[in-house]
Amino acid sequence: SEVEYRAEVGQNAYLPCFYTPAAPGNLVPVCWGKGACPVFECGNVVLRTDERDVNYWTSRYWLNGDFRKGDVSLTIENVTLADSGIYCCRIQIPGIMNDEKFNLKLVIKPAKVTPAPTRQRDFTAAFPRMLTTRGHGPAETQTLGSLPDINLTQISTLANELRDSRLANDLRDSGATIRIG
């Protein structure tokens, strides 16, 4: 069954997938699709690489890692509830029926706005007297209550950058990984 990953509305979601190239630069085509992995290819393709580069992608979907070293983990930017679902990472190893397929379950939950802990000096220094958010209503900029008008998209982006840099390292070990060659 699928491994489950979670994110909140407005965050960037991270779906880990890795392989080890047989030799440096000896890349294998990879596709990411929304929906469980079919027999061949990926359904509803959101991103694709070939032997050299990312040759197809759609908005909000990108590879944050070094795909030339086999890190083909998918980042989905500014997620909404509708991004929930099964995603397929397919490593298209040459030969008949050699592909490695990984189904990853992404569950998005509503965002929660909470008071900023005082220990987050780096965050509150940039945005004094403010609430941290994990991203409300991504369809348009939202501002918080009686505070000065503050663009939550900017706050979410900063929070996501801090979080993603840690999360990428945390999840590398738990992701889908194969070795080729």
């Epitope: 909404t80 509708a82 569950v107 939950k109 991504p138 369809a139």
Partner: antibody, heavy 119, light 107 residues
Framework: QGQLQQPGAEVVKPGAAVKLSCKAS????????MQWIKQRPGQGLEWIGE????????DYNQNFKGKATLTVDTSSSTAYLQLSSLTSEDSAVYYC????????????WGPGTLVTVSS | DILMTQSPSSMSVSLGDTVSIICHAS??????IGWLQQKPGKSFKGLIY???NLEDGVPSRFSGSGSGADYSLTISSLESEDFADYYC?????????FGGGTKLEIK
């Protein structure tokens, strides 16, 4: 999937308060957000708010702030909607609904409770 | 608030017909839309979520489509149990908002 049980009806006096229940069964209560919705004949559907039973976090429709309070009792797997200072405008059917497996917020609905505000 | 404009408000159709109900949102809702069914005197049932996905146990004659601000629910080969009220609901932004409903009646 699970089931949601709600009392059929409540009759309350103007100015009073009422606490409506929504008892969940057949699933892990704390794993899924609960929505509350109001339906008045000829007025369509209004979203009241939602609650995460795992930590009591709530989001409210601003139109219902001060009118509605959402709570849960995890020991009995029950969600509650309390309505205060009732008027005839509050006479309606109130539904709870739980999210589905892939964050579909309105997947499964309770049968609804008809609240009648009458002296 | 996001306004969900649903049309038509009612329609008379025959068994076996294929019908489509439209919802237009006042802004892009990025497929954060559900479709609900309410039979007379009864509660609601979720039919479609995230624009195109069928809720568990929903017959395949129901389908959802659309993107951006425009979405539709299609029921093919109508059966007697499909005569009911249908609503769309957006959940990309607070507050969640509903369409005004469509009543499907037997011609």
């Amino acid at each position: 999937q699970g089931q949601l049980q709600q009392p059929g009806a409540e009759v309350v006096k103007p100015g009073a308060a009422v606490k409506l229940s929504c008892k969940a069964s057949g699933y892990t209560f704390t794993s899924y957000w609960m929505q509350w919705i109001k339906q008045r004949p000829g007025q369509g559907l209004e979203w009241i708010g939602e609650i995460d039973p795992s930590d009591n976090y709530t989001d409210y429709n601003q139109n219902f702030k001060g009118k509605a309070t959402l709570t849960v009792d995890t020991s009995s797997s029950t969600a509650y909607l309390q309505l205060s200072s009732l008027t005839s405008e509050d006479s309606a059917v109130y539904y709870c609904a739980k999210e589905g497996a892939f964050s579909s917020p309105f997947a499964y609905w309770g049968p609804g409770t008809l609240v009648t505000v009458s002296s | 608030d996001i306004l969900m404009t649903q049309s038509p408000s009612s329609m008379s159709v025959s068994l076996g017909d294929t019908v489509s109900i439209i919802c237009h949102a006042s802004q892009d809702i990025r497929s954060n839309i559900g479709w609900l069914q309410q039979k007379p005197g009864k509660s609601f049932k979720g039919l479609i979520y995230h624009g195109t996905n069928l809720e568990d146990g929903v017959p395949s004659r129901f389908s959802g489509s659309g993107s951006g601000a425009d979405y539709s629910l299609t029921i093919s080969s109508l059966e007697s149990e499909d005569f009911a009220d249908y609503y769309c609901v957006q959940y990309v932004q607070f507050p969640r908002t509903f369409g005004g409903g469509t009543k499907l009646e037997i011609k």
